[in-house]
């Protein structure tokens, strides 16, 4: 059987000879050289060599436990002559013993960490970790202890865990933001002779809201012209806050002052400035100076710092309104006037009034914007603003005239303003009614008396207030002995009725009926329209079959005896 124990070998051997490991030996070995010892497995023939006659094993190279702590090899004892094993192949272990040849190494060369400013003493910042490649199961070669080399009295480190904590009360970022801490890790439990490594921890204090906003001055003064429209920025104010980020965000508001309704303050998120803007139209002539109380406050407040005082500040803003030479102002935004269409030239329609709002009260002159009255239908008295006609009007041509009147300061022609005038032309009964269409109808030869052969409609260009009322009648010259009658329906329509039984187209092929249409307005207007009635042959249903061909071709050359 084999005779050996586990082999142990000290790492990092520095001797000049090969390092002796141990001896493989079989009790079958008679010592006569008849056995050959063979080594195989981890490092055999390279790291470990065997004297094949004696079984002595040597290490040829310096071994590092941290690279490989255990080597597993196999041993054979073989009869040199026959190759026959005298023992079963057996596995054995060479264990490398540790020496303290590795310093602790931090997982990072440089750590970065943050901790809020004003943190309580003992607040966790970061944990650093150093590892030692030496054997943790043997001695203290890998027992690491942490200590702080640089960074006191601000920070401390727990010797066992490497946890870095704050060590000083009220560390203020606004005073100092960056700290460089150097931590040492030493093996051998920190004892003398232990190996050590260091790391740098860059610690940044993060901001908390421990500073209120402050205006650098108590009073601000701005000027703005009275003409500034709503939304016009008139000045910027800025409170400063020693904090950063959202802790330095500022909201501005107007809390008091007679300009409370006239001005607004908006916060510029980029610059953290308060922009004073015009809220309502200003009038120098009414009020020349406004004062406002503007407040700057932090929107996000940490309750634990409220003892430091309110997280807001206020300043007075004085706004001076500057006079502006303003254009004349009309008494109305628009004027609506009316005039009858039968008005004579130079008829006055109405008047406009404009005044200079400035204290100087400069006189104004009036004119018509000719781009809006190309036909020069209207004119204006430049002194008093009276509007009058300069041409005859016709409602039926144009109902509304939209013109623009200009008021200009006499002393400063650059100052002018405009107003729209809407002139409505009122109706006058100056148009006679007439047929709605050209009427050409027919009557059947076999028609019976009082048969309706056509309904008449009339139109009138006028637009009477109470609506149209038309009356229809045969012209006096045709009234007696007519073959047809006109029946007024009293609804602005009339019917043509047959007056006899039967018509002979060979005797009379066409009748022309003169019809008088009158309106009911003042003065009464009337016109005469002619209705053409042709005599046609019809079927028994009354449908036209044929008419006198000439009636279609020469209606004017026909007899007028109706």
């Amino acid at each position: 059987s084999w005779m050996w124990n586990q082999f142990f070998l000290l790492e990092e051997y520095t001797g000049s000879d090969y390092q002796y490991v141990g001896k493989l030996h079989s009790d079958q070995d008679r010592g006569d050289g008849s056995l050959k010892y063979i080594l195989s497995g981890d490092g055999a023939g390279d790291l470990f060599i065997i004297n094949e006659n004696t079984g002595d094993i040597q290490a040829t190279k310096r071994l590092d436990r941290e690279e490989k702590p255990v080597y597993i090899l196999r041993a054979q004892a073989i009869n040199r002559r026959t190759g026959r094993p005298v023992e079963p192949e057996s596995e054995f272990i060479i264990k490398i013993h540790d020496i303290n040849d590795n310093e602790p190494i931090f997982t990072k060369e440089v750590y970065t960490a943050t901790v809020p400013e004003m943190s309580d003493v003992g607040t966790f910042v970061v944990q650093v970790t150093a590892t030692d490649a030496d054997d943790p199961t043997y001695g203290n070669s890998a027992k690491v202890v942490y200590s702080i080399l640089q960074g006191q009295p601000y920070f401390s480190v727990e010797s066992e865990t490497g946890i870095i904590k704050t060590a000083l009360l009220n560390m203020d970022r606004e005073n100092r933001e960056q700290y460089q801490v150097v931590i040492q890790a030493k093996d051998m439990g920190g004892q003398m002779g232990g190996l050590s490594g260091t790391t740098t921890v860059n610690i940044t204090l993060t901001d908390v809201n421990d500073n209120p906003p402050r205006f650098p001055q108590s009073t601000y003064q701005f000027k703005t012209p009275e003409s500034s429209p709503p939304g016009t920025p008139i000045g910027r104010i800025k409170a400063s806050d020693a904090d950063v980020g959202e802790n330095a965000e500022i909201e501005y508001s107007i809390t008091d002052g007679e300009g409370l309704d006239m001005f607004d303050v908006i916060t510029d998120q980029e610059t953290q400035e308060g922009i004073i803007t015009v809220k309502k139209l200003l009038d120098f002539e009414k009020k020349k100076v406004y004062t406002l109380k503007v407040e700057a406050s932090n929107p996000y407040v940490e309750p634990r710092f409220l003892y430091l005082g309110p997280f807001k500040d206020s300043a007075t803003v004085r706004i001076v309104v500057e006079d502006v030479d303003e254009p004349p102002v009309f008494s109305k935004l628009a004027y609506i006037l009316q005039i009858r269409e039968d008005a004579q030239i130079n008829t006055t329609i109405g008047s406009v009034t404009a005044q200079d709002p400035d204290a100087a009260r400069n006189p104004v002159k009036y004119s018509v914007d000719r781009h809006t009255d190309m036909d020069r239908i209207f004119n204006i008295d430049s002194g008093n603003g009276s509007i009058f006609t300069s041409k005859l009007l016709d409602r039926e041509t144009l109902l509304w005239h939209n013109i623009t009147v200009i008021a200009t300061e006499i002393n400063n022609p650059k100052q002018s303003s405009r107003v729209p005038l809407y002139i409505k032309v009122l109706d006058v009964n100056d148009n006679a009614p007439e047929f709605a269409e050209f009427y050409e109808t027919f009557v059947c030869e076999k028609a019976k008396a009082d048969q309706l052969i056509q309904t008449l409609h009339a139109v009138d260009k006028d637009d009477p207030y109470s609506g149209h009322q038309f009356s229809f009648s045969l012209a006096p010259e045709a009234a007696s002995g007519s073959n047809f009658t006109i029946q007024d329906n009293k609804d602005n329509t009339a019917g043509i009725l047959t007056r006899k039984n039967g018509y002979n187209r060979h005797e009379m092929s066409t009748y022309l009926l003169p019809v008088v249409i009158s309106d009911n307005d003042y003065p009464v207007q009337s016109s005469t329209g002619t209705v053409t009635v042709r005599v046609c042959a019809c079927d028994h249903h009354g449908n036209m079959q044929s008419c006198h061909a000439e009636a279609l071709i020469h209606p004017t050359g026909l007899s007028t005896g109706a």
Epitope: I78, N79, R81, T82, G83, R84, P85, P88
Partner: antibody, heavy 117, light 111 residues
Framework: EVQLVQSGAEVKKPGSSVKVSCKAS????????MHWVRQAPGQGLEWMGD????????HYTQKFKDRVTITVDKSTSTAYMELSSLRSEDTAVYYC??????????WGQGTTVTVSS | DIVMTQSPDSLAVSLGERATINCRAS??????????MHWYQQKPGQPPKLLIY???NLESGVPDRFSGSGSETDFTLTISSLQAEDVAVYYC?????????FGGGTKVEIK
Amino acid sequence: EVQLVQSGAEVKKPGSSVKVSCKASGYTFSNYWMHWVRQAPGQGLEWMGDIDPSHSETHYTQKFKDRVTITVDKSTSTAYMELSSLRSEDTAVYYCARGDLGRFDYWGQGTTVTVSS
Amino acid sequence: DIVMTQSPDSLAVSLGERATINCRASESVSIHGTHLMHWYQQKPGQPPKLLIYAASNLESGVPDRFSGSGSETDFTLTISSLQAEDVAVYYCQQSFEDPWTFGGGTKVEIK
């Protein structure tokens, strides 16, 4: 380079003896056993015996035990095989071969021994 | 004595084809996982040449188309792809006990 160089061919009378030499070079002669193997014409290989040069320990096959003697001269790294009482069936090529763990890893070129009256 | 029986006596194989030679020992030649069986190649007019030792280990310088396997009493030499230069007689040999004995040989030819 390992080399085994054998002596030349021999023609022998029946009943006589023959001594074949094998000179080794290219390795430590004492560290390896030397074997002798013969091959009759058209036949297979037949192991005859071996010797440990360091102790001159020998092993012979039963068939040749009484007629074969294997010796060495360590000073010249030469092994010898002597076969006595030769008969015609001893006509064969005789090889020396280096032994290592039961295998023959190097062989001599062979010596032809002819036994004829 | 341990008798070594080789089969077949001769073998004709096409170039590039597999050749398999068997060797049976009259008793086990294995001990402690070591198989004391070796294979040789002999070409006409030349001494034998070691191919495989301890049943499956390829001797240095021998092409890897040669391989050996087996244990106890049954062993095999395989030529995976026969080449022209592989024409020879192949012998098995045991070193398990004295006297060391050889098989009768197998002649390998090209078909």
